[in-house]
Every structure is written in structure tokens, then in C-alpha cells.
Interface confidence: low
Amino acid sequence: QLLEPCGYIYPEFPVVQRGSNFTAICVLKEACLQHYYVNASYIVWKTNHAAVPREQVTVINRTTSSVTFTDVVLPSVQLTCNILSFGQIEQNVYGVTMLSGFPPDKPTNLTCIVNEGKNMLCQWDPGRETYLETNYTLKSEWATEKFPDCQSKHGTSCMVSYMPTYYVNIEVWVEAENALGKVSSESINFDPVDKVKPTPPYNLSVTNSEELSSILKLSWVSSGLGGLLDLKSDIQYRTKDASTWIQVPLEDTMSPRTSFTVQDLKPFTEYVFRIRSIKDSGKGYWSDWSEEASGTTYEDRPSRPPSFWYKTNPSHGQEYRSVRLIWKALPLSEANGKILDYEVILTQSKSVSQTYTVTGTELTVNLTNDRYVASLAARNKVGKSAAAVLTIPSPHVTAAYSVVNLKAFPKDNLLWVEWTPPPKPVSKYILEWCVLSENAPCVEDWQQEDATVNRTHLRGRLLESKCYQITVTPVFATGPGGSESLKAYLKQAAPARGPTVRTKKVGKNEAVLAWDQIPVDDQNGFIRNYSISYRTSVGKEMVVHVDSSHTEYTLSSLSSDTLYMVRMAAYTDEGGKDGPEFTFTTPKFAQGEIE
């Protein structure tokens, strides 16, 4: 038994560039040749335990055999040299691991960052995968001094072990080395102070101003290497519920500062702020954002009066009428603060005024049959809105001028209303609407539109398949004009039920059918037409179509003494629904006719 290897493979640690050719040789020792009665022609090459084809093998002399591989692509191959001892027993001589890969690419895009309070971190693009163990070393030096090398763990970045020195230029480059080659990146030369990423500003606080409801004052603490750097800021803000940030123009925050007043804000609105900083030259990196801080602008007087309307209740006597003044709460964007109350002033023609302070959104008063002027203002702690003014004419005055060409139509899940204005200048329009039902009263909602508007959508929460009665009233300086109404659906559906048909009169060869209109609660849309289907027990079905304005129809050319089955369907724009089936029998003889 030989204790020493019987021979060796050269090279012993083969590393091959992918796609290239590679030759290995196996040299047998003389002692081995004699011991096993072999020579190099007895050598069998194997890769990963599989025999290499003979055509890749060359016997060089009695001790040496070579094997050649072309276009090497496998990352790792176990290559063994074996002999057939005594001509038949395979004996392992030597084995090596053959690795394949690529020499390192020249690293590119080398950049460095100095996170404030930490050492410098440099990153680069190593290029293509080498498939080999590759060492990346970050080298750095001054003109006169070398710094310790930085050995990269991941091959794409390295944090140096020394603290950066500012205001002195440093040269930095990356060396990449593996078994197939060594390469250096282009070097970069910079002053570390131009690569600083400051820590985020902190202690950000927000205060409002009683004098100006459109501003908020910010103050914060900046680090900037403990005051070594002058920093400029980037300020962003948003309303509390918004998702998108608004940018304060960078040119407004160019100079180093630790406070700033943000202008053009909405009154009584909560804003969220964040801030970050960078070296004032713009070199280096933006800090991360500070923690967010919020503040609310001061209140301002309401920016407009509420929408204002009135309804007259049926009068009990002849001298007085009950008038319900109604108005809408202002949206937050117009209230500019918490509305404390509303001031209503009622003035009778050329007479004394009566002032009411109301916390709700309606006021019912008994008025004589004279003309009145009502004004309404909303009040918060800063002041009152402008007044909305309504003229309430005497009940004896007939309203003139109404809108024309009133139309309503659904679009984009909204119910739109449009009209042509009357020929006289309008102060505003009032739109009122309610669900028509035979089971419940028409509970009205309303909205006000400016004089310039002649197309709008109803802003309430509307339901599908419900019939809405919509009324539009122009309002003039002298009082309301005439009202125009129409019916509309946000979305139609097929009727909930079909008509119930009956016979009004049955003759030998004809029958008059009658039906009631489907109740509005079951219509689910505009009934466009009806269909009447009728048949005998043996005959084919006949269908007639009837306009929706009819409530009766005469079937003619019927057979005498015959049982007929009849059914009706009603159709909206969205489909139809059958009513119950009804049967009738025609008489054998006409009236007065004898067999």
C-alpha cells in the first residue's frame, strides 16, 4: 500500500475564466508506475465522478496525461485523476476543485457619504458578478499620507475606520482583486465636508399668530457638525388630512436659519410640517426629515355668509303667516373658526328691525302680510361674516320670472340639473329636492347656487331607483321668482313589480283590459311602455306594446267561447317586470245573439 499520493494534478488550484479553454495535467510518480504496473495510458479523468470523453485526453509520455476543457461554464467542478490498477481496479490518484468565473470589472459610480456623527461610507457598482471570491478594498489618501485600507464585506460598500478630516481634500478609489485579476476604479477627489449628510433638524415647534390667521411660525434646532457647517433648509407642509406635501420654495430657505414663517395658509386649519437640511452650498446630502410637528392657524371671521332660504307655512288666520327661515352650516373652509351663533335681522318695510341671535340653523317667525327683508350673518370669536339678504314679499305678490329649459340627468354617479336663466338679473338660485313616495311625506333638502351658475349637481346623499322631485327657484333682489319642477332618477332599475291587469268589458271577439299605474315607490324609473302578452291554452302567444300614458287597451279578433291568459309587463330604461297572470273567457254569443 502506498501512503503518498500516486501522483499530482497541475495546476493544483485551478481558476478559469468562463468561456475560455483550460488544460490540466496529471503526473504519475515512478513508484506508482511500478507498484500498480501502469503508465499514463491507464489514467481515467473524471469531472464530478463522470468520466471525461477520450477525445479530450492526451497521453504526453509514460508518466503524464493531460485533459482539455473548452468553453468552461460550470462555476465549480471536481476534477480527479484516476488509474486502472492491474488493468481493472480504479484507483484515485489526485483531485482538485476547478473554479470558473470572471476577473473583476472596473468598479464604477464610486460615491461617498459622511453621515454626521459617523465615519465615511463609500459605495460603488462592482459591475458583473465574478462568481469567484473577490476582495474589494477601499483605498484613501491625502497628498502626503495614506489612510488605513477598508476591506468591504459585501463588495459594494465600505465604512472607513477613521473619522473624516474636513476642509482637506481626500483621494478615494476601490481596488477589486480575485484569482483572475486585479483592477482599480477611477479615483475621486473631494473634501469630506462636501459629502456630509447632516442629522435631521430637531425640536421643531409651530406657533400661530393672533394678528394674522394666514401664517404659522416655525423654529427648530440644526446640528451641522456642531455649528461647523452652515445649513440651508427644505420645509414641507400639508393639511392634517392630506397625503401630499406642499413645498416651501427652496429659494426662500437658502440662507442658514433656525426659524421661518410660512404664509398664505388657511385660517383655523391644522397643518403638519417637516424639515430637512443640507450644506448651504448645496453640496453633500439632504438630511433625513425631522420629526413632524403640527400647529393650527388662528381663527378669522367667516369668509362668506351661509346659504339662506325660507319656507312659508300655511297661515292660520288672514293677517299673519308663519315663516321658517332656514340656512346651512358653513363648511370649515368658510367658517374659519368655531361658529358661535347666527344673527338674523328682520326689517319690515320702512319700519323697526328685530334682531334674533340663534345657535341652530333655522328660525320660525310669525309675520304680517307686509314685505320683509331678512339678513343673516354667522359669527365666530373673531367676528361676523358678511350678511346674506333675502326679501320676503307680501303673500299677495305673484312671483314672476322663472327659469326655462329645466333639465336633469345622471352623470358620473351624480344627478345634474341645468337651466336657462330668466331674463332679469338674478341674486342666486335655490334648488330643492325630495323623494316622491306614496308611503312617506316628501322630506325636502335644498342647496343654494350663485347667480352665475346654470348647471350643478345635487349635493345630498341620493339613492338609486328613487324618484326625485327637483324644484329650481331664481331669487331676485325683490324676492323669489317662480318655481319650476321636474322628476329625475340618479339611476333607474327595472320596476319592482308589473301592472295587475283586469277586464273592464268582455265581448264575443274583443276584450277591454284595464290596469292601474304602478305606484311610484315600485316604478324604480320612468315607465316608458307596457307589453301585453295573451294566449289561449293551445294557441301561440301574441304580444302588443302600449304607450305608458295608457291605462286601458282593447284586444280584438278574439275567438268566442275561449279561455284567454293575459299578462302585462312594464318597462323602464333599465328593463321590465311582469305582473301577475289573469284569465278571462269570451262568451259564445254576442249580446242579443241567439243560437
Epitope: N109, K197, Q236, S287, D288
Partner: nanobody
Framework: QVQLQESGGGSVQAGGSLRVSCVIS????????MGWFRQVPGKEREGVAA????????IYANSVKGRFTISQDSSKNTVYLEMNGLKLEDTGMYYC??????????????????WGQGTQVTVSS
Amino acid sequence: QVQLQESGGGSVQAGGSLRVSCVISGFTYRQTFMGWFRQVPGKEREGVAAISTGGGSTIYANSVKGRFTISQDSSKNTVYLEMNGLKLEDTGMYYCAASTVITSVSINRGLYQYWGQGTQVTVSS
């Protein structure tokens, strides 16, 4: 909060084309650097291309130069990667990333703070 949403990935034959998109929301788009990165299982995420949304300057990895184009539509807060002449090795999960810290365009992934969920691109022969 900041959100990046990629779309447009899919399967394509070698030599074909594909366009992936990334919509950015939650911060001021014009202040940003946007990058496309890709990753195959078991390998590190690698930079493909990047763009400065303010100035429009671009950078590309050597492996995609001349085949891929990065562009933006600032009105839609969207960055695109147009990929032509696709090769088998372009297969991978493509990620969109945003950086608000850098001051020059870069495809070093460590400089990007915000990442999308990724969209798969598969190139077959």
C-alpha cells in the same frame, strides 16, 4: 406616507421590448432622484438606471446601456423604464426606488430610502 407602485412587468421573448412604470406619491416629486434596480434570487439587487426628476440627468449600468431608457412624466408623478433588445439575463424582479438625500444621479442602491414592491420581468428564449 411615501409610496412607490410599479407596474408593467410580464413575460417577453428574447429580443422583445417591455415598459415598466413607477408611480410616486406622498412627497414632492420634483425634489427627487428615482432609480430602477433588479434582483434575481440568490443575488444582490443591482442598479439598472436612474434619473434626476428635477434636471432630467440620467445614468445607466453598463449591461443595459443603449438598450434601456429611463424617462419621466412629472405631470403624472411617474418614472418609466423602456427596455428594448431584452436578453435572458435581464430576467428578474424590477424595483423602483426613490432618494431625497443625494445631490447627483446614482445607481448605488444604498443611497435610496424608499422602495416599491417590485414587478417581475421574465425573458425567455
